[in-house]
Amino acid sequence: ESLGWDIAELQLNHTGPQQDPRLYWQGGPALGRSFLRGPELDKGQLRIRRDGIYMVHIQVTLAICSSTSTSRHHHPTTLAVGICSPASRSISLLRLSFHQGCTIASQRLTPLARGDTLCTNLTGTLLPSRNTDETFFGVQWVRP
Amino acid sequence: ESLGWDIAELQLNHTGPQQDPRLYWQGGPALGRSFLRGPELDKGQLRIRRDGIYMVHIQVTLAICSSTSTSRHHHPTTLAVGICSPASRSISLLRLSFHQGCTIASQRLTPLARGDTLCTNLTGTLLPSRNTDETFFGVQWVRP
Amino acid sequence: ESLGWDIAELQLNHTGPQQDPRLYWQGGPALGRSFLRGPELDKGQLRIRRDGIYMVHIQVTLAICSSTSTSRHHHPTTLAVGICSPASRSISLLRLSFHQGCTIASQRLTPLARGDTLCTNLTGTLLPSRNTDETFFGVQWVRP
């Protein structure tokens, strides 16, 4: 562990209450193929424990979705991954809209610091799939 | 090689016969920019030779595709990456539908074990592109 | 740095003049969360300084875009990442079309050599977003 190979892959636990756009994550071998090796979960949000540059990746699929169902909704459904705390470091890191699709997937390199908590905000009224092969979120430490 | 930096990037060789949804892959410098360094191919399917956590990534583009042509077909086209053998470890790791798009691309971290064979199943009747910059599949060992 | 952990994450600076489909990138902590550690920029294009296998990733979002605005244009908007110089190594590495979507995102493993310059060509007449969480391009050295 001292090598700094911090890594995590999470599966969706649940969405937040009505006014909370955050997705709540869970991880651990007992749950399937998700795991946390270094980072930790704080009330379903991922907290970084080691400074460095990380590869952050995410895939979110909307539940019982067809290409028409996404575009039928007035407010476009958008997924944003960002640092939500500490407040002084709050920033959006990655943002995608679903438009006429049912899945978004992306990845990026970004510097993160010990204590940064990452939030994944899903705006709109569509429920994400909890299937572990359709919705997942992970980080991988890649260098100091 | 003893460092465990197993890595592979494959290009599409061909699709399977009618009742076989699997994509068959090929790799090697003679073919272009694909390669296998550690993992191996078994009848076009990727076999893992070292335990660890891997970053699995894939992009598949449908041949001669327009956004209308995908939705014109009755059965939605879906791509699933999973462990197909040994049977005791069979599981879907990553799944995406094309909906009104012509390309899916995603990636995830997952634990894999020596002997795991990964299959990429394309359901539906649409032929994928064989262009090496449009359709590819790869894995990268990232930590024990 | 001698470990060979070359890495870069870039944000969009500007598009090229009318007949130049290339996107021009910029990077550095003063600009936000972009950085160059090893690779360098040559007139907005990313140049590799160390041989190896790299994970190349990109996300491009079209500006003020809706799912209809992309499909309304006769010429589909396509993003291609490739080696553009030296000419002897020119090749397309990764290609995606927007179709009815507003964002493309993908990644792949590819061998790159010192001196390779990567270009990201956006064909069509649509302007990409310069928001740093919507459009970004990066590479990560992963092994020799």
Partner: antibody
Amino acid sequence: QVQLQQSGPGLVQPSQSLSITCTVSGFSLTTYAVHWVRQSPGKGLEWLGVIWSVGSTDYNAAFISRLSISKDNSKSQVFFKMNSLQADDTAIYYCARNIYYGNVYAMDYWGQGTSVTVSS
Amino acid sequence: DIVLTQSPASLAVSLGQRATISCRASKSVDASGYSFMHWYQQKAGQPPKLLIYLASNLESGVPARFSGRGSGTDFTLNIHPVEEGDAATYYCQHSRELPLTFGAGTKLEIK
């Protein structure tokens, strides 16, 4: 086994319409597309249009104003209708199944053909 | 529309010899790593029969004496060795885009 059986008139009056039914067996219209092609000594083989597995259609632009293709999946029937026929529409009309790959438009099974003469 | 030009219009080949039929497209029919060109055989009084799809793929049940090759705009159908039952008219067809078009045909006679 796969079969496409065509039924329709042999003689059509000028300016009248042509209707042909293609009844299929051995495969499902919810999985395969069906094309219509005609053949005449003067123009050879001409592709007229296609009905996709979901029921949407594409037509040859030269015929789009007077051609209609529809189907009834439950009866395994595809219906072809062409309006305003003239003498140069005299041809053998075929229905044909698209091959398994939905984005490769080649035809692996054909009906026996309906020989149509346009004459008064 | 893509125009397909077949040559020759007719040919006579001795039993057991090779027959070569060409098809030239007015623009490339290549896309996505494939060549969208197909070949049919039609005997008198019968509908066309698919022989080759995607330039070189043999349709199920078609003898290996039939082979196709080519890319871009130039394609060939080869029959070797020719048998008596191969007397027919052969057509190429592209599916690179709509509308689909066919060549005018090449009539093969067995000597």
